[in-house]
């Protein structure tokens, strides 16, 4: 029997053991987070699968993921949302220490999908482990991109109080309008619930003493946020290593000086 023809995409295929990984992550998450113990992980997997299985992987919509979002609904306390752009590792290191602050990947749905790739095929119940659409080379409405757009929008919509965002000061565009933060999250913060956005610009070089809060892209971010009737603040984090150390040990004498 000849193998059935399969669409070839430019991106890497579904992560090995994807269903098992999602299910295992869900079980682990619900064991560690008492407020999510009620979650039925099999139902979560069924809804996740339902979003992309049997569907053409370049025609996925936000609507497809809403049943999953419904099952994974979680609230973050006001003032405790941390967004990030192009500096995921430091943001996650921070919330691992500062346990009362949360990135999207600290929430159930973000945790389930973090660093995974997935896609299906039109009219079959198979998962495609060979290749998946690449955002640039194939299409933007692919299962992974639409998932992150959907959950990021929801995460921003539900944020309240003072929202923080960690930005990478080493990049040419510290604030990038085309990033998930710039294209989705910024525009879905709700002015009636969010008083302010505070940007933390993370410096790369040890000797970098520039005020990156004056960067043109940060001014652009300030303008976008201010037009949405949300106040904007910006802080330079000159020494990210020291910053993390001081989050761990705020009593340390060296933490009384600037970071």
């Amino acid at each position: 029997v000849l193998p059935r023809w399969r669409q070839q995409w430019s991106g890497s295929g579904t992560t090995s053991r994807f269903p098992e990984t999602v299910l295992a992550r869900c079980v682990k998450y619900t064991e560690v987070h008492p407020e999510m113990r009620h979650v039925d992980c099999q139902s979560v997997w069924d809804a996740f699968k339902g979003a992309f299985i049997s569907k053409y992987p370049c025609n996925i919509t936000e609507e497809d993921y809403q049943p999953l979002v419904k099952l994974g609904t979680q609230t973050v306390p006001c003032n405790k949302t941390l967004l990030w752009s192009r500096i995921k590792d430091l943001a996650h290191q921070f919330t691992q220490v500062q346990r009362d602050m949360f990135t999207l990947e600290d929430m159930l749905l973000g945790y389930l999908a973090d660093d995974l790739t997935w896609c299906g095929e039109f009219n079959t119940f198979e998962i495609n482990y060979q290749s998946c659409p690449d955002w640039r080379k194939d299409c933007s409405n692919n299962p992974v991109s639409v998932f992150w757009k959907t959950v990021s929008r929801r995460f921003a919509e539900t944020a309240c109080g003072v929202v923080h965002v960690m930005l990478n000061g080493s990049r040419s565009k510290i604030f990038d309008k085309n990033s998930t933060f710039g294209s989705v999250e910024v525009h879905n913060l709700q002015p009636e619930k969010v008083q302010a956005l505070e940007a933390w610009v993370i410096h790369g070089g040890r000797e970098d003493s520039r005020d990156l809060c004056q960067d043109p892209t940060i001014k652009e971010l300030e303008s976008i946020i201010s037009k949405r009737n949300i106040r904007f603040f910006c802080k330079n984090i000159y020494r990210p290593d020291k910053f993390l150390q001081c989050v761990k040990n705020p009593e340390d004498s060296s933490c009384l000086s600037g970071i």
Epitope: E63, Q66, K70
Partner: antibody, heavy 119, light 107 residues
Framework: EVQLLESGGDLVQPGGSLRLSCGAS????????MSWVRQAPGKGLEWVAD????????WYADSVKGRFTISRDNSENTLYLQMNSLRAEDTAVYYC????????????WGQGTTVTVSS | QSVLTQAPSASGTPGQRVTISCSGS??????VSWYQQLPGTAPKLLIY???ERPSGVPDRFSASKSGTSASLAISGLQSEDEADYYC??????????FGGGTKLTVL
Amino acid sequence: EVQLLESGGDLVQPGGSLRLSCGASGFTFSDHYMSWVRQAPGKGLEWVADISARGSNTWYADSVKGRFTISRDNSENTLYLQMNSLRAEDTAVYYCAKNWNYNYGMDVWGQGTTVTVSS
Amino acid sequence: QSVLTQAPSASGTPGQRVTISCSGSSIQNNYVSWYQQLPGTAPKLLIYRNFERPSGVPDRFSASKSGTSASLAISGLQSEDEADYYCASWDDSLNWVFGGGTKLTVL
């Protein structure tokens, strides 16, 4: 033939209780989310409650939260709505409906059962 | 008060094309479905997943969605199309919500 059949509607006094049932046939009941939808006399449709396929998740309209409980018995292919602390404004025809792939639409409806709350 | 807004009534003559609209912010990111309720009967699904027709629904019924609005079009209007028409979607809390309904009269 795919079918839903409601029962249990009755005349009940304010503050009273009632349990509605909906028997399903012709499809794999345990694979589908199910809903209760009601329609007051001369009014439009109002969503009441949802239950997930395995029964582990339930959702309610604000107007019935804390008073109504949706449940299901997949072994019996039956959906239930337990209605407590009934009010005059709960008077309506109650329909059970099968959800098509979660959020596509409600593709199968029962014929409805009438609940009248009056003293 | 429904978060999906429909005109209370619409009318047309036999053979005409009639459009019924539905609007609400939650439509943007959620599927829209449409239901027909003939007098004294249970609702019937006409359109699911924004524009798709279940088998058995005539192709005279079509639908579309754009942004925060959706519409149902009935072409070649017939007397048996006289009914109440409801749009439905999930709301911002991801629970079902119905429009207030549009009563269609065939003149």
